[in-house]
């Protein structure tokens, strides 16, 4: 008598999530009499997937009519496949009895589920960094299968190389996650720059998914400060200008100090944007030279985006050089960021 064979012809089957999977199984003999059951996994923890005789298996149907005389095809179809259905499926022949006795198992068919990765989510640093510093961006995508996946980073269309990528878990799983970190060197020109995380996977048919982050969220461009004096007016008033240039973001507070005392405080708002995304701002202060007997120390103090204040100081020299009265000549910049501006007293 020929020994019963349980034949599972496919060692593996791959199905897209949402589709149906057909798991084939035939037996070589009708004898002995007894049922076929399908299990996922082996050993004491195996799960019953289909038993024609009893149980409710709403997603599983027999491919052939199992009640038909001389039926030797016990293939099944599982509908609406999800990643959780992945595993090795065994077609098992039992001999009829009380209880039925397990006789022979097929070699097993490994079902793998192709699942699309989720849209990549890119997150940047929690706090802004200044130009010439390196910041890290992370990109995450989840729920894909099989494990093979490609992730690339781009900054303004150029691929980044300082990248570390991990796919978890390391071994076989129903689905996988990818997490990648890219280190990006910021420059003063990066306000309008963008980083893109691009994920390619077999389920995407060559149309990769992209996640983006704007460097404007991560960068701080500190301002340049320039203090100049306009021509002295006939009424002995000196017009002093503090030019604050090339800064980002717009959040900026400027304070004028006269001899250490607050003269005026201004907040930047609704500034026009430069081509590179930075901002400029100019503030004027009129100093009445005739009202002062001694030299006046003026300070332009700028607090940008919550950072420590930056000062630019200079002195208006009263009656020191009457011959230079009304001149437009700026003095040498001293080591203490001071300008000496000479004016005559009335």
């Amino acid at each position: 008598e020929e020994e019963l064979q349980v034949i599972q012809p496919e060692k593996s089957v791959s199905v897209a999530a949402g589709d149906s999977a057909t798991l084939n199984c035939t037996v070589s003999s009708l004898i002995p009499v007894g049922p076929i059951q399908w299990f996922r996994g082996a050993g004491p923890g195996r799960e019953l997937i289909y038993n024609l005789k009893e149980g409710h298996f709403p997603r599983v149907t027999a491919v052939s009519d199992p009640t038909k005389r001389n039926n030797m095809d016990f293939s099944i179809r599982i509908s609406n496949i999800t990643p959780a259905d992945a595993g090795t499926y065994y077609c098992v022949k039992f001999r009829k009895g009380s209880p039925d006795v397990e006789l022979k198992s097929g070699a097993g068919t490994e079902l793998s589920v192709r699942a699309k990765p989720s849209a990549p989510v890119v997150s940047g640093p929690a706090v802004r960094a200044t130009a010439e510093h390196t910041v890290s961006f992370t990109c995450e995508s989840h729920g894909f299968s099989p494990r093979d996946i490609t992730l690339k980073w781009f900054k303004n269309g150029n691929e980044l190389s300082d990248v570390q990528t991990n796919v978890d878990p390391a071994g076989k799983s129903v689905s996988y996650s990818i997490r990648s970190t890219a280190r990006v060197l910021l420059t003063r020109r990066d306000v309008h720059s963008q980083v893109i995380c691009e994920v390619a996977h077999v389920t995407l048919q060559g149309d990769p998914l992209r996640g983006t982050a704007n460097l404007s969220e991560a960068i701080r461009v500190p301002p340049f400060l320039e203090v100049t004096q306009q021509s002295m007016r006939a009424d002995n008033q000196v017009n002093v200008t503090c030019q604050v240039t090339k800064f980002y973001p717009q959040r900026l507070q400027l304070t004028w100090l006269e001899n250490g005392n607050v003269s005026r405080t201004e907040m930047a708002s609704a500034l026009p944007e430069n081509k590179d995304g930075t901002y400029n701002w100019t503030s004027w202060l009129l100093v009445n030279v005739s009202a002062h007997r001694d030299d006046v120390k003026l300070t332009c103090q700028v607090e940008h985006d919550g950072q420590p204040a930056v000062n630019k100081s200079f002195s208006v020299k009263v009656s020191a050089h009457p011959k230079e009265q009304g001149s437009n000549t700026a003095a040498e910049n001293t080591g203490t960021n001071e300008r000496n501006i000479y004016g005559g007293s009335g």
């Epitope: 996994g41 006795v101 097929g106 799983s173």
Partner: antibody, heavy 122, light 112 residues
Framework: QVQLQESGPGLVKPSETLSLTCTVS????????WSWIRQPPGKGLEWIGF???????FYQSSLKSRVTISLDTSKNQFSLKMTSVTAADTAVYYC????????????????WGQGTTVTVSS | DIVMTQSPLSLPVTPGEPASISCRSS???????????LDWYLQRPGQSPQLLIY???SRASGVPDRFSGSGSGTDFTLKISRVEAEDVGVFYC?????????FGQGTKVEIK
């Protein structure tokens, strides 16, 4: 090549909870049973229990009320928690992989960790 | 629970000579599929156990062919055709038919 590494405290006080973790490297959690086995000093092997990749657990009946085995597939780790320990729980604890190819039984405990010594003492 | 009983518990051996260890189970380990759920392990001094034989007679990967397993039902034998010095340690049989998995008491093999 699959390797297993046990980690956890070497000294536990009586009545407290013993917690051990086994990290699986170089291979997959799926399709295997993940077992804890212990060996008291100078004695033989005692199976504590195992967990299948699908989350189903099986325990030694004498320890069932005190033991929990759990699986973290994202970290490729499985863990043992044993409550209300006594001096009788002093042993070398091994984590191990058990194979299952088909049928109802198992096909050998083929990969073992190096073992971690746990002493229960105040 | 299935009880596993080994004999002898101690086995002095001479290198180059054969050796044999017996294992008996309290119920048959031959399943209806024809598979025998009996394994043999060796625990060398200071080391973890290693799988030698599974399924009653199949050698595990990397195990020398001087080790062989035989038997069916409830009586099993592990044979070493020519003992080598590295074979010293404690040999355990274990059943994998049903939970709880159980092991024999162990047979300590030492050089005479």
């Amino acid at each position: 090549q699959v390797q297993l590494q046990e980690s956890g405290p070497g000294l536990v006080k009586p009545s407290e909870t013993l917690s051990l973790t086994c990290t699986v490297s170089g291979g997959s959690i799926r399709d295997y049973y993940w077992s804890w086995i212990r060996q008291p000093p100078g004695k033989g092997l005692e199976w504590i229990g195992f967990i299948y990749y699908n989350g189903r657990t099986f325990y030694q009946s004498s320890l069932k009320s005190r033991v929990t085995i759990s699986l973290d597939t994202s970290k490729n780790q499985f863990s043992l928690k044993m409550t209300s320990v006594t001096a009788a729980d002093t042993a070398v604890y091994y984590c191990a992989r058990v194979r299952a190819y088909s049928g109802i039984g198992l096909d050998g405990t083929d990969v073992w960790g190096q073992g971690t010594t746990v002493t229960v003492s105040s | 629970d299935i009880v596993m009983t080994q004999s002898p518990l101690s086995l002095p051996v001479t290198p180059g000579e054969p050796a044999s260890i017996s294992c008996r189970s309290s119920q048959s380990l031959l399943y209806s599929t024809g598979y025998t759920y009996l394994d043999w392990y060796l625990q060398r001094p200071g080391q973890s156990p290693q799988l030698l034989i599974y399924g009653g007679s199949s050698r595990a990967s990397g195990v020398p062919d001087r080790f062989s397993g035989s038997g069916s039902g409830t009586d099993f034998t592990l044979k070493i055709s020519r003992v080598e010095a590295e074979d010293v340690g404690v040999f355990y049989c274990g059943q994998a038919l049903q939970t709880p998995l159980t092991f024999g008491q162990g047979t300590k093999v030492e050089i005479k």
